[in-house]
C-alpha cells in the first residue's frame, strides 16, 4: 500500500491504493547538495545524473572506515524521496547530485558556497527548464551561504531547504534562515512535530511550511534492491522540492514567490499540535505541512496572501522591528504584537523603493515584532495615506480618495507611552467601510491599492467581554489582506494573520476588569480579483 | 485477481525475429517491476532483465544485454522480450514475473512461452 | 554477481520424512538498514512456472502450507519440509534479490524414496 508520506501530501482526489500523482515533474531538474549516492539503485536509476563535483572535509578520527553504504546512505535515500520510481513524490523529475557532505554527513560553508557557484555556472552555460536546488543540510548562521542562497534565487532558481534538527529557532542555521529559500521544518505520520531523540525539527519565523519527515520510507545504499526509514527535516525538504518540481511541471513559468505562496495556500492548515513548540514561539511558526494542490492548474484567480513576521525588536525604548516582502510581492498591510502589549503600534513606509511593515517598542516593553501581510497582485499600484493624530473626539480618520483605489489594510502608530486607555472605543460611522479609523493620539496609516478588478470589504467581529482572543475570517473566495484591532481596546497585544483569519489578542482576562473598554474588535480587509479569476478562465 | 498471461508457444527458425508477450491484470500495472527469466530444457533459472512500465527503465543481466529487448506498453499493461535475430540457443522456456519495490521477490508468474529455433 | 550454490543436487526422501535443502551465497544477502535477507525459495513442479513459497529467508507466503519452513543469515540459509508429501515432488530453487543481476540456486530436485 502507499507509504504513508506519500498519501499526507496527496489531495483526497487522487487517493488511491498507488501514489500516482498527475504530473511527475518531467520538465525540471532537481540538484540535490548533499552526500554521495548509489545512483545504480532500482529506485532512482536513470534519474539521477552524478555530477563531478565534490568539495568535502576530511572525515573525523583515525578509526574511521569509509564504507560505499554508508558514505551515500543520506543522499541516496533523499534523491529516492524526490524523484524515485516507487516511493519518490514527483516520479519524472530528473536530478543531478553535487557532493558536499562527507562520509559522516559533515560539510563545510566553503564546499555548499563552491557548489551553488557550480550551479549558476551550470545554469548559464546550458539553460534547461525550472531549476529547484535542494539543501538538506543546516549549520550554524552564516551570512555569506545566506548571501549566496539569495543571489541564486534572484536568478530564477527554487532553493529548497531543511530547517534543521536542533529543536531550536531555524533563523539561528543556514541556509534555513535566508528569506529567499523555502525552508522545511518536519512531521510525523499523526501530524505533530518530528522528535529526534533529545532533539527534533526546528521552528519559528523563518519555517516556510512543514512537511512529512519521520518514517520515510526511500532507496537504502545498502543494496540494489533496498528501501529503508530515515526521519528529519532533510526528509521533509526532499517532499516539498517533490512538490516544487511538480508544481514547476506543470505551471513552468511561476516565479519563486509564486510557488511559495501556493505551497503555502495548498498545504493542510492548523492540524500541527503548537503545544510541542516553545510558547515564545508558537505564534511564530507557521501551522501548515505540505501538499499537492488538488489540481496541477487552474490556481492562478486566486490572490495568494501569506503572513510574514519580523525579528523580534529587543526591548529598548527606541527599537523597532521590520517584516519585508519579498520582491514580487506587495505588502498590502502591516500589523505589529508585543508580548506585554506594550508597544507604540507600526507603520507602512518606503525603504529602498518598496514598502516595508516596521513595528515600534514602547517604554517598558520587552520588544514587538512587526507583521507584514504580503500578497500576489499583479499590475498593483499601492500607495500609503497618513492622518497625523488628530486630537479631535472622533479620533483619528483616514481612507483611500484616489479613484480606483481600496482599502487593503490599516495600521496606527502613536508617539505617546500611553494612549489613554480608559478612552471608550471609536466606533466605525457605518456605510464608510473604505477608511481606517483610530485612536485620536495616533497617526494612522491607509494601504490604498488599485489592481485592475480588486475589491476589498471590511468585516469586524466585535465581543463585549474581554477575551484572550477574537477572530474574524473571509469567507471562501475572499482573501484576507488587513488584520487590525478597533481602537480603544487597552489591552490589545497586537492583531496579525493567521492564513485566512484575523487574529485579535488580548492580555491575559483575568489581569483586565470586565468593565466597558474590555471590548474587543478584530477588523479584517477582505479582497478578492475579479481580474484573475477571468485571466484564468480565459486560460482554460 | 492478479495473474500475468503470456502469450503461446512460437517455433521459428534461426535468424527471424520474435516478440512475446506477458498482460498484467488485477492490479497496477505500472506501479511494479516485470522481469523474465529463462530456462532452457532440463535447465535452472536464468533472470535476463527487467523492466518498470511506469516510465519503462530498463535493466539486462549483463549475460543477454544486446541479446534481447525488453519494452512495455502500459496502455494495455503488456510487457514485451524480443529478440531481432534468433538462434538454435535461444531454445527455452521465458517465464514473466512481476516484483514490488516493497516485495522484491517474485510473487506472480506467468505461465510461462515455449520458444522453439530450429531450421 | 552474487553466486547462488545449493546442495544437495538431488534428496530422496520418505514420505512423511524431513527435507533438508541448503543454499549459500558468494556474500551476504543480509543488510543492516532494515535487517532483512534479500533471499527467497520457489517451488517449480514439472510443467508449471516456479511459486513463491518463502521470501525474506523466513517468511512464508501465504498460502503455503506450514511444512514449509525457511531458516539462516547472512550467506547460508536452509528450506525445511518437515513432512514429505506426495504433491512436494519438485524442483526447488533459492533466489537473492538485493542485486543486479538477480540470481537463483542450480536447484535442488526433491523426489519420494
Known amino acids: 500500500s502507499i507509504p504513508w508520506n506519500l498519501e499526507r501530501i496527496t489531495p483526497p482526489r487522487y487517493r488511491a491504493d498507488e501514489y500516482q500523482p498527475p504530473d511527475g515533474g518531467s520538465l525540471v531538474e532537481v540538484y540535490l547538495l548533499d552526500t554521495s549516492i548509489q545512483s545504480d539503485h532500482r529506485e532512482i536509476e536513470g534519474r539521477v545524473m552524478v555530477t563531478d563535483f565534490e568539495n568535502v572535509p576530511e572525515e573525523d578520527g583515525t578509526r574511521f572506515h569509509r564504507q560505499a553504504s554508508k558514505c551515500d546512505s543520506h543522499g541516496t535515500h533523499l534523491a529516492g524521496v524526490v524523484s524515485g520510481r516507487d516511493a519518490g513524490v514527483a516520479k519524472g523529475a530528473s536530478m543531478r547530485s553535487l557532493r558536499v557532505l562527507n562520509c559522516q554527513g559533515k560539510g563545510t560553508v566553503s564546499g555548499t558556497l563552491i557548489g551553488l557557484e557550480f550551479i549558476r555556472k551550470s545554469q548559464l552555460v546550458q539553460p534547461v527548464g525550472p531549476l529547484v536546488v535542494l539543501l538538506p543540510l543546516a549549520g550554524g548562521y552564516s551570512r555569506v551561504l545566506n548571501a549566496a542562497c539569495q543571489r541564486l534565487a534572484r536568478a530564477g532558481v527554487v532553493l529548497v531547504t531543511a530547517a534543521g534538527n536542533f529543536r531550536d529557532d531555524a533563523c539561528l542555521y543556514s541556509p534555513a534562515s535566508a528569506p529567499e529559500v523555502i525552508t522545511v521544518g518536519a512531521t510525523n505520520a499523526q501530524d505533530q512535530p518530528v522528535t529526534l531523540g533529545t532533539l527534533g525539527t526546528n521552528f519559528g519565523r523563518c519555517v516556510d511550511l512543514f512537511a512529512p519527515g519521520e518514517d520515510i520510507i526511500g532507496a537504502s545504499s545498502d543494496c540494489s534492491t533496498c528501501f529503508v526509514s530515515q526521519s528529519g527535516t532533510s526528509q521533509a525538504a526532499a517532499h516539498v522540492a517533490g512538490i516544487a518540481a511538480m508544481m514547476l511541471s506543470a505551471e513552468p513559468e511561476l516565479t519563486l514567490a509564486e510557488l511559495r505562496q501556493r505551497l503555502i495556500h495548498f498545504s493542510a492548515k492548523d492540524v500541527i499540535n503548537e503545544a510541542w513548540f516553545p510558547e515564545d514561539q508558537r505564534v511564530l511558526t507557521p501551522n501548515l505541512v505540505a501538499a499537492l494542490p488538488p489540481s496541477t492548474h487552474g490556481a492562478g484567480w486566486q490572490l495568494f496572501c501569506r503572513t510574514v513576521w519580523s525579528a523580534h525588536s529587543g526591548p529598548t525604548r527606541m527599537a523597532t522591528a521590520v517584516a519585508r516582502c519579498a520582491p514580487d510581492e506587495e505588502l498590502l498591510s502591516c500589523s505589529s504584537f508585543s508580548r506585554s502589549g506594550k508597544r507604540r503600534g507600526e507603520r507602512m513606509e518606503a525603504q529602498g523603493g518598496k514598502l516595508v511593515c516596521r513595528a515600534h517598542n514602547a517604554f517598558g516593553g520587552e520588544g514587538v515584532y512587526a507583521i507584514a501581510r504580503c500578497c500576489l497582485l499583479p499590475q498593483a499600484n499601492c500607495s500609503v495615506h497618513t492622518a497625523p493624530p488628530a486630537e479631535a473626539s472622533m479620533g483619528t480618520r483616514v481612507h483611500c480618495h484616489q479613484q480606483g483605489h481600496v482599502l487593503t489594510g490599516c495600521s496606527s502608530h502613536w508617539e505617546v507611552e500611553d494612549l489613554g486607555t480608559h478612552k471608550p472605543p471609536v466606533l466605525r460611522p457605518r456605510g464608510q467601510p473604505n477608511q481606517c479609523v483610530g485612536h485620536r493620539e495616533a497617526s494612522i496609516h491607509a494601504s490604498c491599492c488599485h489592481a485592475p478588478g480588486l475589491e476589498c470589504k471590511v468585516k469586524e467581529h466585535g465581543i463585549p467581554a474581554p477575551q484572550e482572543q477574537v477572530t474574524v475570517a473571509c469567507e471562501e473566495g475572499w482573501t484576507l489582506t488587513g488584520c487590525s484591532a478597533l481602537p480603544g481596546t487597552s489591552h490589545v497585544l497586537g492583531a496579525y494573520a493567521v492564513d485566512n483569519t484575523c487574529v485579535v489578542r488580548s492580555r491575559d482576562v483575568s489581569t483586565t476588569g470586565s468593565t466597558s473598554e474590555g471590548a474587543v474588535t478584530a477588523v479584517a480587509i477582505c479582497c478578492r480579483s475579479r481580474h484573475l479569476a477571468q485571466a484564468s478562465q480565459e486560460l482554460q | 485477481q492478479v495473474q500475468l498471461v503470456q502469450s503461446g508457444a512460437e517455433v521459428k527458425k534461426p535468424g527471424e525475429s520474435l516478440k512475446i508477450s506477458c498482460k498484467g491484470s488485477?492490479?497496477?500495472?505500472?506501479?511494479?517491476?516485470i522481469s523474465w527469466v529463462r530456462q532452457m530444457p532440463g535447465k535452472g533459472l536464468e533472470w535476463m532483465g527487467m523492466?518498470?512500465?511506469?516510465?519503462?527503465?530498463?535493466s539486462y543481466n549483463p549475460k543477454f544485454q544486446g541479446q534481447v529487448t525488453i519494452s512495455a506498453d502500459k496502455s494495455i499493461s503488456t510487457a514485451y522480450l524480443q529478440w531481432s535475430s534468433l538462434k538454435a540457443s535461444d531454445t527455452a522456456m521465458y517465464y514473466c514475473?512481476?516484483?514490488?519495490?516493497?516485495?522484491?521477490?517474485?510473487?506472480?508468474w506467468g505461465q510461462g512461452t515455449l520458444v522453439t529455433v530450429s531450421s | 554477481d552474487i553466486v547462488m550454490t545449493q546442495s544437495p543436487d538431488s534428496l530422496a526422501v520418505s514420505l512423511g520424512e524431513r527435507a533438508t535443502i541448503n543454499c549459500r551465497s558468494s556474500?551476504?544477502?543480509?543488510?543492516?538498514?532494515?535487517?532483512?535477507?534479500?533471499l527467497a525459495w520457489y517451488q517449480q513442479k514439472p510443467g508449471q512456472p516456479p511459486k513463491l513459497l518463502i521470501y525474506?529467508?523466513?517468511t512464508r507466503e501465504s498460502g503455503v502450507p506450514d511444512r514449509f519452513s525457511g531458516s539462516g543469515s547472512g550467506t547460508d540459509f536452509t528450506l525445511t519440509i518437515s513432512s514429505l508429501q506426495a504433491e512436494d515432488v519438485a524442483v526447488y530453487y533459492c533466489?537473492?534479490?538485493?542485486?543486479?543481476?538477480?540470481?537463483f540456486g542450480q536447484g535442488t530436485k526433491v523426489e519420494i524414496k
Open positions: 488485477g492490479y497496477s500495472f505500472t506501479n511494479y517491476y
Open positions: 556474500q551476504s544477502v543480509l543488510y543492516s538498514s532494515n535487517n532483512k535477507n534479500y
Open positions: 514475473a512481476r516484483d514490488h519495490w516493497s516485495k522484491p521477490y517474485f510473487d506472480i
Open positions: 523492466i518498470y512500465p511506469g516510465d519503462s527503465y530498463t
Open positions: 533466489q537473492q534479490y538485493s542485486s543486479f543481476p538477480i540470481t
Open positions: 525474506w529467508a523466513s
